[in-house]
């Protein structure tokens, strides 16, 4: 398997140069179109886990606790991405670690991560066929953050 | 420029097969060694910005506010990464948005992100020479999170 990185297989003939022909410089001008996760993953709030623990990993000690949900795509690099799912609508009190404080909102922090998709190269066949790698921006929620509610002017 | 993805240019002869020779399967077993940021960036706490605003972006509205520091490497994909720098040692009070609450710590959330480094392929020269892409895990701080201090057993 030989992998090449290119702009996108939308205009396939220029996607993968033949082994003899070296690709032009522009071949690396990657598209940066955004890709969304497979389906909108609802930010459901699980009351039973809406608490900030005093030990364990950072996502469970946070006053805006979250869990991680796996998003796997075998033709993407990286194959496994994790989306943060906020467990509470509001921030948990620092005092009790359980009661919610309506003064703070627990909100997801989004990030457009660079990922690559493996696509068969146009006209490539056989056991040693090459693949094109399409670069994309993929929206992931990294964590949940406790913020002061936005005040509208 | 033709980019190929491979295990790492530590054993360069197998890094970039000739145009005639199809790469062996192992050629894709990338190393996943962690890479540290260019220099240790100190977590200085800026008193003047240690406040949670009521508008603006999420990192300034958070009660664990942070700024972003650019880390640019032209031979890496992505070229630009941003490291979150916590602006306060403790979380800011939800009531005032300025006073710190010693019950909460503002801590960075670290993540090992997949990046690629462009390396010249061994023995490749001329205007159309190819490059190897080395896959690496690169530690970035994504955000700062307000957590309850860890209680030691």
């Amino acid at each position: 398997v030989s992998l090449r990185i290119q702009e996108g297989c939308s205009h396939l003939p220029s996607c993968c140069p033949s082994k003899e022909q070296e690709p032009p410089e522009e071949w690396l001008k990657w598209s940066s179109a955004s890709v969304s996760p497979p389906e909108p993953l609802s930010h459901t709030h699980h009351a039973e886990s809406c608490r900030a623990s005093k030990d364990g990993p950072l996502n469970s000690r946070a006053i805006s606790p979250w869990s991680y949900e796996l998003d796997r795509d075998l033709n993407r690099v990286p194959q496994d991405l994790y989306h943060a799912r906020c467990l509470c609508p509001h921030c948990v009190s620092l005092q009790t670690g359980s009661h919610m404080d309506p003064l703070g909102n627990s909100v997801p922090l989004y990030h457009n991560q660079t990922v690559f998709y493996r696509r068969p190269c146009h006209g490539e066949e056989g056991t040693h066929r090459r693949y094109c790698l399409e670069r994309r921006l993929y929206r992931v929620s990294l964590a949940c953050v406790c913020v002061r509610p936005r005040v509208m002017a | 420029v033709s980019l190929r993805i491979q295990e790492g240019c530590s054993h360069l002869p197998s890094c970039c097969p000739s145009k005639e020779q199809e790469p062996p399967e192992e050629w894709l077993k990338w190393s996943s060694a962690s890479v540290s940021p260019p220099e240790p960036l100190s977590h200085t706490h800026h008193a003047e910005s240690c406040r949670a605003s009521k508008d603006g972006p999420l990192n300034s509205r958070a009660i664990s506010p942070w700024s972003y520091e650019l880390d640019r490497d032209l031979n890496r994909v992505p070229q630009d990464l941003y490291h979150a720098r916590c602006l306060c040692p403790h979380c800011v009070s939800l009531q005032t948005g300025s006073h710190m609450d010693p019950l909460g710590n503002s801590v960075p959330l670290y993540h090992n992100q997949t990046v690629f480094y462009r390396r010249p392929c061994h023995g490749e020269e001329g205007t159309h020479r190819r490059y190897c892409l080395e896959r690496r895990l690169y530690r970035v701080s994504l955000a700062c999170v307000c957590v309850r201090p860890r209680v030691m057993a």
């Epitope: 991680y68 796996l70 075998l74 033709n75 | 050629w27």
Partner: antibody, heavy 125, light 107 residues
Framework: QVQLVQSGAEVKKPGASVKVSCKAS????????MNWVRQAHGKNLEWMGL????????SHKQKFQGRVTMTVDKSISTAYMELSRLRSDDTAVYYC??????????????????WGQGTLVTVSS | DIQMTQSPSSLSASVGDRVTITCQAS??????LNWYQQKPDGTIKLLIY???TLHTGVPSRFSGSGSGTDYTLTISSLQPEDIATYYC?????????FGGGTKLEIK
Amino acid sequence: QVQLVQSGAEVKKPGASVKVSCKASGYSFTGYTMNWVRQAHGKNLEWMGLINPDNGGTSHKQKFQGRVTMTVDKSISTAYMELSRLRSDDTAVYYCAREGYYGPSPFHHYAMDYWGQGTLVTVSS
Amino acid sequence: DIQMTQSPSSLSASVGDRVTITCQASQDISNYLNWYQQKPDGTIKLLIYYTSTLHTGVPSRFSGSGSGTDYTLTISSLQPEDIATYYCQQYSKLPYTFGGGTKLEIK
């Protein structure tokens, strides 16, 4: 050698919860995802979900939404699967299975390469 | 979810026979298919991953083939210890799904 040892059989009443444990040994616990699969008597294998012990990340079959909780205790290399609001049709043998990854990185192939011995959970009033 | 249909649901064969079990996916799964063996005592073992690659320690009489939606597990010469139920499983997309199983008996 890789071993997954599960907790013993349980009898539960409808509406109760059950928590099955799976102790791993012979490999790096945090380096491999753990799957949970169940099998009602004489029936097909049914995938319930998986957990990454490194970050606690999970994925589960939609039908178990809100009823299944998968957790790990890294300090003792143990994975747990808790199923709540039990019904009689939850009577089954529950298996944990390590997920191995194979083939050229970064395009891995995944397979449940080592399985626990199974834990029979009986739900009966 | 991707549906996996296995056939036959049961079969009886003699020692030394060539045995074939088929598995059909409800959509193209790009060879992302595994085969498992469940012994009568409930023990489950991985036999084959990625359609045709034998897992460590699996006898060479087992082989797998197929592409697209249709896959096959073959035992070239049936042995008494092969008495078991065989399952296919797709890992093309979460949630993972298994076939209904094929119970293999010796005549």
